[in-house]
């Protein structure tokens, strides 16, 4: 069987060789070939070349579509670091500093307080807040951290909340809160973090951070 295949391949190769030789002879204008034969052979050859070129174009298109598909789903991720603020607002402030991440302009940190996304989709959103408080120095109310959402044309809403009671340690006891969940965000949606007492938040390296990634 293998031997027959080999003979078949050789025969095809020989036919291809003869065909190419004939085209060459047609081009050099050899008298031994009729004009009609030459025209027929040339059009056959042009047909082959056209097919090859079309196939090439299709492959190019497919590849460029793959690239576009890749562009349509770029990685969107952000991780920002807490920033001490003189403002008395309960909304925490963040900065692109230290070992931060801002994948591209499809997610931005606005006014140092909120992460805003440009594309709709499911996002994992998280925040870690470390705070140092003392039972005697603080009010009776627990320390509460809230992850909030503001979408265009909508009121802001709380997505996640966590509460910790104050420590009895002096001058204060460090505790950490971690919030994280998967949420559908609309284009232009912003997420931010609220706390009951921003003055108690720890801003040392790695203690307090905030981020998101598109799934």
């Amino acid at each position: 069987h293998r031997r027959l295949d080999k003979i078949e391949d050789e025969r095809n190769l020989h036919e291809d060789f003869v065909f190419m030789k004939t085209i060459q002879r047609c081009n050099t204008g050899e008298r031994s070939l009729s004009l009609l034969n030459c025209e027929e052979i040339k059009s056959q050859f042009e047909g082959f070349v056209k097919d090859i070129m079309l196939n090439k174009e299709e492959t190019k298109k497919e590849n460029s579509f793959e690239m576009q598909k890749g562009d349509q789903n770029p990685q969107i991720a952000a991780h920002v670091i807490s920033e001490a603020s003189s403002k008395t607002t309960s909304v925490l402030q963040w900065a692109e500093k230290g070992y931060y991440t801002m994948s591209n302009n499809l997610v931005t940190l606005e006014n140092g307080k909120q992460l805003t996304v440009k594309r709709q989709g499911l996002y994992y959103i998280y925040a870690q807040v470390t705070f140092c408080s003392n039972r005697e120095a603080s009010s009776q109310a627990p320390f509460i951290a809230s992850l909030c959402l503001k979408s265009p044309g909508r009121f802001e809403r709380i997505l996640l909340r966590a509460a910790n009671t104050h420590s009895s340690a002096k001058p204060c006891g460090q505790q950490s809160i971690h919030l994280g969940g998967v949420f559908e965000l609309q284009p232009g949606a912003s997420v931010f973090v609220n706390v009951t007492d921003p003055s108690q938040v720890s801003h040392g390296t790695g203690f307090t951070s905030f981020g998101l990634l598109k799934l």
Partner: nanobody, 122 residues
């Protein structure tokens, strides 16, 4: 069970004022935006005003802007609508309403009260 109970409606002369109240119960009042809508005789429902869960964000229909003020007291689970410079065209049944969505201009309500009638006439 969610309940919304409006009060404060009545007959008032053009240019007069009224304050509507809505007592809410059966849900966590401070976690939801609240709305006032109205229905004039023989007309459809019209959105009047919206207020965010914590209060500072308020929105109004153009027809009442500058004359009506929406507010809330989360400690009392109560929504208010202060209506000044009332006109004949403000005559309607006023409803307070809650939506599970957080739209500034509501498209759907899951609960609303029985309404309170406001009549502006000389």
């Amino acid at each position: 069970e969610v309940q919304l109970l409006e009060s404060g409606g009545g007959l008032v002369q053009p240019g007069g004022s009224l304050r509507l109240s809505c007592a809410a119960s059966g849900f966590t009042f401070d976690e939801y935006p609240m709305y006032w809508v109205r229905q004039a005789p023989g007309k459809g429902l019209e959105w009047v005003s919206s207020i965010g869960p914590s209060g500072p964000n308020t929105y109004y229909a153009d027809s009442v802007k500058g004359r009506f003020t929406i507010s809330r007291d989360n400690s009392k689970n109560t929504l208010y609508l202060q209506m000044n410079s009332l006109r004949a065209e403000d005559t309607a049944v006023y409803y307070c309403a809650k939506s599970p969505y957080f739209d500034v201009i509501p498209s759907y309500f899951d609960y609303w009260g029985q309404g309170t009638l406001v009549t502006v006439s000389s």
